[in-house]
């Protein structure tokens, strides 16, 4: 996926098609959720403004064996300009709060939808 600079985001912002597809995947996850997502696994909360895509991937990549978010992990890896591996925390986010994966996905979705509606993908 091509990553383009956003209007107000320091990190890379994907073009509209890629962003919309990520939003759709996150919506699918939240709407199809029956049992606790990823068995209630906890991940680091991230800063949703700076280096968001890499930070989100760095947080989620530490969840293993959860097929529900594998596609999201793959999509986020396309948005992040550097390779991310488990245990890596180089992007701008504060490791002081852990939240459930389900809440992480909801927060990320809300923010991405706002970016999309504002047109922040060019």
């Amino acid at each position: 996926l091509t990553c383009l600079g956003g209007f107000a985001s320091p990190g890379p912002v994907p073009p509209s098609t890629a962003l919309r597809e990520l939003i759709e995947e996150l919506v699918n996850i939240t709407q199809n959720q029956k049992a606790p997502l990823c068995n209630g696994s906890m991940v680091w909360s991230i800063n949703l403004t700076a280096g968001m895509y890499c930070a989100a991937l760095e947080s989620l990549i530490n969840v293993s064996g959860c097929s529900a978010i594998e596609k999201t992990q793959r999509m986020l890896s396309g948005f992040c300009p550097h390779k991310v591996s488990a245990g890596q925390f180089s992007s701008l986010h504060v490791r002081d709060t852990k939240i459930e994966v389900a809440q992480f996905v909801k927060d990320l979705l809300l923010h991405l939808k706002k970016l999309f509606r504002e047109g922040q993908f060019n």
């Epitope: 098609t17 919309r20 979705l109 509606r117």
Partner: antibody
């Protein structure tokens, strides 16, 4: 039951500012994923999207008219407003407001429409 | 802007007929295609969104299909109340754009 109703001046002169009101019921613009659009149709021409406003006050405009358009809302009174500055005879049209489909996805589909209000620009 | 073209500005059909109305986009709109019905009294209703999803309360005789740049609306068993003008609209990118409409008439 969702309803929307447009109101406007009916007739105005060139160079004046057109002010339109969309009064709605059956939903709230304080609810997540809710939005309202304005569309117009000049006689014998295609429908033209003008602008929309979302529950969180995100606004988008048709680039062709952006410099003349202002959209706003009053959530408490369930109204959305559109102002079109420096009107000309080409702005003569039926103006509609419509609600954006509310779901997790962003379809940009309009599920409920007002009946439209006719606006004539004439000197 | 994405141009939406409905080649048939009018169609004539008999009650009970299967009617297909087509719509073409100037570029791939990734199934973000919506169909509307405008009755002679000016009432506009959403029929189909995202190519093939039926809006609530819309009779099942209406269906939509297509992909890429070519889309269609089908009415399987034309009824008198279906006499109206039908518009397509792309929701892939802003500005939202509409087709010119296809007016459906009874033979």
């Amino acid at each position: 039951q969702v309803t929307l109703k447009e109101s406007g001046p009916g007739i105005l002169q060139p160079s004046q500012t057109l002010s339109l009101t969309c009064s709605f019921s059956g939903f709230s613009l304080s609810t997540s994923d809710m939005g309202v659009d304005w569309i117009r149709q000049p006689s014998g021409k295609d429908l033209e999207w003008l602008a929309h406003i979302w529950w969180d006050d995100v606004k988008r405009y048709n680039p062709a008219l952006k410099s003349r358009l202002t959209i706003s809302k009053d959530t408490s009174s369930s109204q959305v407003f559109l102002m079109l500055a420096s009107v000309d005879t080409a702005d003569t049209a039926t103006y509609y407001c419509a609600r954006i489909v509310s779901s997790g996805y962003i379809y940009y589909a309009l599920d409920y429409w007002g009946q439209g209000t006719s606006v004539t620009v004439s000197s | 802007d994405i141009q939406m073209t409905q080649t048939a500005s009018s169609l004539s059909a008999s009650l009970g007929d299967r009617v297909t109305i087509s719509c073409r986009a100037s570029q791939d709109i990734r199934n973000y295609l919506n169909w509307y019905q405008r009755k002679p009294d000016g009432t506009v209703k959403l029929l189909i969104y995202y190519t093939s999803r039926l809006h609530s309360g819309v009779p099942s005789r209406f269906s939509g299909s297509g992909s890429g740049t070519d889309y269609s609306l089908t009415i399987s068993n034309l009824e008198q109340e279906d006499i109206a003008t039908y518009f397509c609209q792309q929701g892939n990118t802003l500005p939202l754009t509409f087709g010119g409409g296809t007016k459906l008439e009874i033979k």
